[in-house]
Amino acid sequence: PEPPTACREKQYLINSQCCSLCQPGQKLVSDCTEFTETECLPCGESEFLDTWNRETHCHQHKYCDPNLGLRVQQKGTSETDTICTCEEGWHCTSEACESCVLHRSCSPGFGVKQIATGVSDTICEPCPVGFFSNVSSAFEKCHPWTSCETKDLVVQQAGTNKTDVVCGPQDRLRA
């Protein structure tokens, strides 16, 4: 028969014959022959391969370096890489999460729209009219101005995006 020019899924062409790829978690040791199947062996304890492959070396699991603020979110297996995340108060600088930076704080006049996670930074928003934030914080939202009326008081000093209103007693009309 004619030697193949293409092979089925999960196979590869070598020496004019189709050999089975090694399954995820295993590396290639020797190609198949006309008498034997592909020889594969498992990846080591700190290694992985996540696809059907013909790799002769497994990949090393990612190291979550605590000096960079990283910790293990999910331990790697022979078929998956380790997933790193950041320590509390820090977030990844990239999708690959190779290092961490401190969560950003929202300055006075801005409130937290979305609290940071291990993989995303704090999202701040300017405090709209009627709201304020007088602190730099990674958690505080914009607070509504105090309602003087509900306290039977009147506004003595208008609020801003950084300050609350100041309430005071109503002027009494003299009889």
Epitope: I14, L28, V29, S30, D31, E39, L41, G44, E45
Partner: antibody, heavy 117, light 114 residues
């Protein structure tokens, strides 16, 4: 043709050194683990060691071979080597070059090494 | 190093006999065991790999079984061309960095005509 051809055997004095070569052809040398196996006259097979596939293939040896024998390869020349130092009379054997690790799919014809004064 | 203990060292049998050869590993090797046949003046020939997989072109009268430490090669009906020496090969594969890969052959079993 898929084959392994050993060379470099011969008579050597005790304490001497010898380098065996194994020329591989007909298959992708770079993606196959390669082993050395020896057989003393009239005796059984004895595993010497292995070099795994890939450019920086790891090597492993039988405990008796560690420190005296070294396996290496030149992928560009599709050639496997066995460097043997501090040879002893008990190293007299036919040395086979072989393809595979947990099972050997291809053997060379062997080269005879005789250690004698 | 791993040690493979093969028995018997020799056996005499007749054509048509059922022959069994055993091999024991000094530590668990999973299914990393192969069987070879060798005739005088020739290189060994692979018969069985992964403990029980028959190499292509090898007659179906040859079969292998076992895992861990105990393995068996069976020739269901001995043929004239089967008189030879048989070897098992065990392979200890390490997935840790503290131990090393090693392999060993059994001492061999010579099958002779009764």
């Amino acid at each position: 043709e898929v084959q392994l051809v050993e060379s470099g055997g011969g008579l050597v004095q005790p304490g001497g050194s010898l380098r065996l070569s194994c020329a591989a052809s007909g298959f992708d040398f770079s993606s196959n683990a390669m082993s050395w196996v020896r057989q003393a006259p009239g005796k059984g097979l004895e595993w010497v060691g292995i070099i795994y596939a890939g450019s920086s293939g790891s090597t492993y040896y039988a405990s008796w071979a560690k420190g005296r024998f070294t396996i290496s390869k030149d992928t560009s020349k599709t050639t496997l080597y066995l460097q043997m130092n501090s040879l002893r009379a008990e190293d007299t054997a036919t040395y086979f070059c072989a393809r595979g690790a947990t099972y050997i799919t291809l053997w060379g014809q062997g080269t005879l090494v005789t250690v004698s004064s | 190093d791993i040690v493979m203990t093969q028995s018997p060292s020799s056996l005499s049998a007749s054509v048509g006999d059922r022959v069994t050869i055993t091999c024991q590993a000094s530590q668990s090797i999973g299914s990393y065991l192969a069987w070879y046949q060798q005739k005088p003046g020739q290189a060994p020939k692979l018969l069985i790999y992964r403990a029980s997989t028959l190499a292509s072109g090898v007659p179906s009268r040859f079969s292998g079984s076992g895992s861990g430490t105990d393995f068996t090669l069976t020739i269901s009906s001995l043929q004239p061309e089967d008189f030879a020496t048989y070897y098992c090969q065990g392979y200890y594969y390490s997935t840790t960095t503290t131990t090393y890969d090693s392999s060993a052959f059994g001492q061999g079993t010579k099958v002779v005509i009764k």
